[in-house]
Structures are given as structure tokens and as C-alpha cells.
């Protein structure tokens, strides 16, 4: 049995990190395999991850930790039974991937102006919370070529756009993903998409 | 409801061995480490050691040539035992849960107090 | 191993003050910091980890701060039931505790 490529981990800077890897041929991973961990530094307990198959040769394991703080180090130690197979580290936070926003709702009884709101995903005593900034996709459900992206670098987790500029009697979609500046984080994946009609109509002299 | 209920001799003898018992409820020792720590009359907390869910355990330099923590998982027990007791040794002794990947506290035993005196 | 000296050793105040317990590692322990409140006969309560992140249940008016070496533990309006000796703990092994500070009422 081997290790085809190595794992590779991201943290959610909260209490969840994600390690993937691919094995040589066909594995059943939650089977065969155990990914151990160890905080460095500490006097501490070694966790197990039971891993789950990612398609054939995939494996992946979600690793349970307390909040995340900048100097804690992992030791992984990926076993197939009595063997070894691949020893490494990894410092979640110099490997951040945020969670996702949630929440996303779309108010339209403002005048003239679609207002997007959404949830920030971490508590006010995580170190990420201050320091998320957004991404907005909105898009045309029927052309989809009709699309947007909305930059959002104050922290309010909210956007305004005027509705003149879409469509008038279009159903259109939105999502909304974050990252964090300070810690050079991933993108995080997209929020569920939220759909509205946009039944916004100019003023009769301005057509 | 997470509990953790120490138990043993009020008394021991100098140069005798102390054996306390945490019995837990609530949680599996298959799945959290718990650890020992004493307070003497009047003093501050001191950490002696753990016992972790997969059996291996860590203690204080200052007191591992006399210290033993082993459990049974099955009847939820945590065994500590102590020899060499000395009048220094008396002293508040509480078993605590560990939380999560911290070695930290979340949740202790009221704490059963032992004399050492002949 | 690392010691941890708290200051003061005690204090008094009154209900509804402002209190500042700090805490000071011998050494770098990055922010692995712990605090406990204990009252008399009775075991700690975990109040704060990782030197900010709230305990499971803890009332808001406390908060933590610090990393490296220096550390503190705010109650921004005391109550009445938080008179109590307060604890901070390191867990760069082997884990030691402060000293205590008794926080006493005026």
C-alpha cells in the first residue's frame, strides 16, 4: 500500500481541518487507513481521523481540534495498520480556508435598491471575524453570461446595488464567499445560492 | 450531565502509598483524557498528571518516579496512585477532564481532601 | 519549567467595577493560556483558553488578552458572585498554574 500523493490540509481557523490524499490503486479508506494527530508544543492527547473515500483512489479526514491559535503545529502520522505510510506536520494557520457566509437573503422592499445581507460564519471571539472580506456573484438565471462580481472589503456583511442596474423582470441568483486578508487565506467555497425576481421598473419618463 | 467523582482515604501514613479512584459519568474514557491535579491548604493548583483515551499517559517531572494513573474503561474508573506519601503530599486532590486538543480543564471532580500524618 | 507569576496577589473591589488580573510567563507560551475561577471549597471553573476564547457558558463580561508573555483577565462589571481566587494555567508541558489572585469585595 502507498501513498500516491501526499496529504495536503486546510483549516477552517475554528475547530475543523481538512486533509486529502490519494493512495496508489483503489482503497477502502475508512477501512484501511488511520490519519493520527498531535499538537506540538503541548502535553497532549493523539486523535485519531477515521478518513472517508473521495472517489477511488481519494481519501480524505476531517480532524477535530479546538480554536485554532497561530503557533499550533500537528504532527500527521498516516497509518495502514501496523505500517507507516507517510509522516508529516501542518499548521493550520498558515493553511486557512474559511467557512463559507450563511444566511444569504435578499431584500428588495428597499426603493430602487437590492440589499444582500448575510451571516459572517465565525463568532466575534475568533480571530478571523474582523478580517473577512466578500465576494458576491450574482447572476441571470437565464443568461448566464449576464453575471458579476461584487468586491465587499468593509467588514459589514452586506451589499447595495442599485436594481436599475438588472434587468427588469428577471429572476436572478447570488452567492457569496469570503477570505481573510491577514492570514493569506484560500477563497472559501460559495454559500447556497439565494433567488430573487427583480420586478424593478424605471420611471415611466425615463424609458 | 458530565461528572467526575473522586474517591479514597481521608488519612495516610507517612511513607505509605495513596490510592484515589475518579469514577466519571457522562462521557467515555475511550474518548477524553482526564487529568490529576492537587491543591495544597491554602496554596496554588498543581498539575501531576494524565491518563489519555488511548491509554498513554504524561506526568509532572517533579513527581513521576512516584506516580502511576492507569483507568478501566469499562467500569468509567480512573486510578491514581502515589507512594512515598509524605506530610507535604497533603493536599485537595481533584481529577479533571480534558478538553478537546488542549490540555485544559472543562469540567473537575469537587476534589476529596488527604492528610498525611502519622 | 515555566513559571507563571500573577499580580496582584489579592484585590478588592466593588460590585460593578472594572478588574484587571494579569498574568506573566517566564518564558514564550505563544497563546497557550488558560484561567479558572475557584471559590472557597469548591473545584476551578474553566473561564478562558487559548488566552481569549470564552469557555462553554461563561458569562460575556469576562475577556482575555495577551500572547508571548503577558497576559490579562478583564471582568468589565463585576458581580457579586464573581468574588473568587483566580487561576491562570500555561499548557506548553509540563503545565503549571499562577499563584492565584483573590479578588475580594470592598
Known amino acids: 500500500m502507498k501513498v500516491l500523493q501526499e496529504p495536503t490540509c486546510v483549516s477552517d481557523y475554528m475547530s475543523i481541518s481538512t486533509c486529502e490524499w490519494k493512495m496508489g490503486g483503489p482503497t477502502n479508506c475508512s477501512a484501511e487507513l488511520r490519519l493520527l494527530y498531535q499538537l506540538v508544543f503541548q502535553s497532549s492527547e493523539t486523535h485519531t481521523c477515521v478518513p472517508e473515500n473521495n472517489g477511488g483512489v481519494g481519501c480524505v479526514c476531517h480532524l477535530l481540534m479546538d480554536d485554532v491559535v497561530s503557533m499550533d503545529n500537528y504532527t500527521l502520522d498516516l497509518w495502514a495498520g501496523q505500517q507507516l505510510l507517510w509522516k508529516g506536520s501542518f499548521k493550520p494557520s498558515e493553511h486557512v480556508k474559511p467557512r463559507a457566509p450563511g444566511n444569504l437573503t435578499v431584500h428588495t422592499n428597499v426603493s430602487d435598491t437590492v440589499l444582500l445581507t448575510w451571516s459572517n460564519p465565525y463568532p466575534p471571539d475568533n480571530y478571523l471575524y474582523n478580517d473577512l472580506t466578500y465576494a458576491v456573484n450574482i447572476w441571470n438565471e437565464n443568461d448566464l453570461a449576464d453575471s458579476r462580481i461584487h468586491n465587499v472589503t468593509y467588514l459589514k456583511p452586506t451589499l447595495r446595488i442599485p436594481a436599475s442596474t438588472l434587468k427588469s423582470g428577471i429572476s436572478y441568483r447570488a452567492r457569496v464567499r469570503a477570505w481573510a486578508q491577514h492570514y493569506n487565506t484560500t477563497w472559501s467555497e460559495w454559500s447556497p445560492s439565494t433567488k430573487w425576481y427583480n420586478s424593478y421598473r424605471e420611471p415611466f419618463e425615463q424609458r | 450531565e458530565v461528572t467526575l467523582k473522586e474517591s479514597g482515604p481521608v488519612l495516610v501514613k507517612p511513607t505509605e502509598t495513596l490510592t484515589l479512584t475518579c469514577t466519571v459519568s457522562?462521557?467515555?474514557?475511550?474518548?477524553?483524557?482526564v487529568h490529576w491535579i492537587r491543591q495544597p491548604p491554602g496554596k496554588a493548583l498543581e498539575w501531576l498528571g494524565v491518563?489519555?483515551?488511548?491509554?498513554?499517559?504524561d506526568y509532572n517531572a517533579a513527581f513521576k518516579s512516584r506516580l502511576t494513573i492507569s483507568k478501566d474503561n469499562s467500569k468509567s474508573q480512573v486510578v491514581l496512585t502515589m507512594t512515598n506519601m509524605d506530610p507535604v503530599d497533603t493536599a485537595t486532590y481533584y481529577c479533571a477532564r480534558n478538553k478537546g486538543t488542549r490540555p485544559v480543564f472543562d469540567y473537575w471532580g469537587q476534589g476529596t481532601t488527604v492528610t498525611v500524618s502519622s | 519549567d515555566i513559571q507563571m507569576t500573577q499580580s496582584p496577589s489579592s484585590l478588592s473591589a466593588s460590585v460593578g467595577d472594572r478588574v484587571t488580573i494579569t498574568c506573566r510567563a517566564s518564558?514564550?507560551?505563544?497563546?497557550?493560556l488558560a484561567w479558572y475561577q475557584q471559590k472557597p471549597g469548591k473545584a476551578p471553573k474553566l473561564l478562558i483558553y487559548n488566552a481569549k476564547t470564552l469557555a462553554e457558558g461563561v458569562p460575556s463580561r469576562f475577556s482575555g488578552s495577551g500572547s508571548g508573555t503577558d497576559f490579562t483577565l478583564t471582568i468589565s462589571s463585576l458581580q457579586p458572585e464573581d468574588f473568587a481566587t483566580y487561576y491562570c494555567q500555561h499548557y506548553v508541558s509540563p503545565l503549571t498554574f499562577g499563584q492565584g489572585t483573590k479578588l475580594e469585595i470592598k
Open positions: 518564558e514564550n507560551i505563544y497563546s497557550y
Open positions: 457522562g462521557f467515555s474514557l475511550t474518548n477524553y483524557g
Open positions: 491518563i489519555w483515551s488511548g491509554g498513554s499517559t
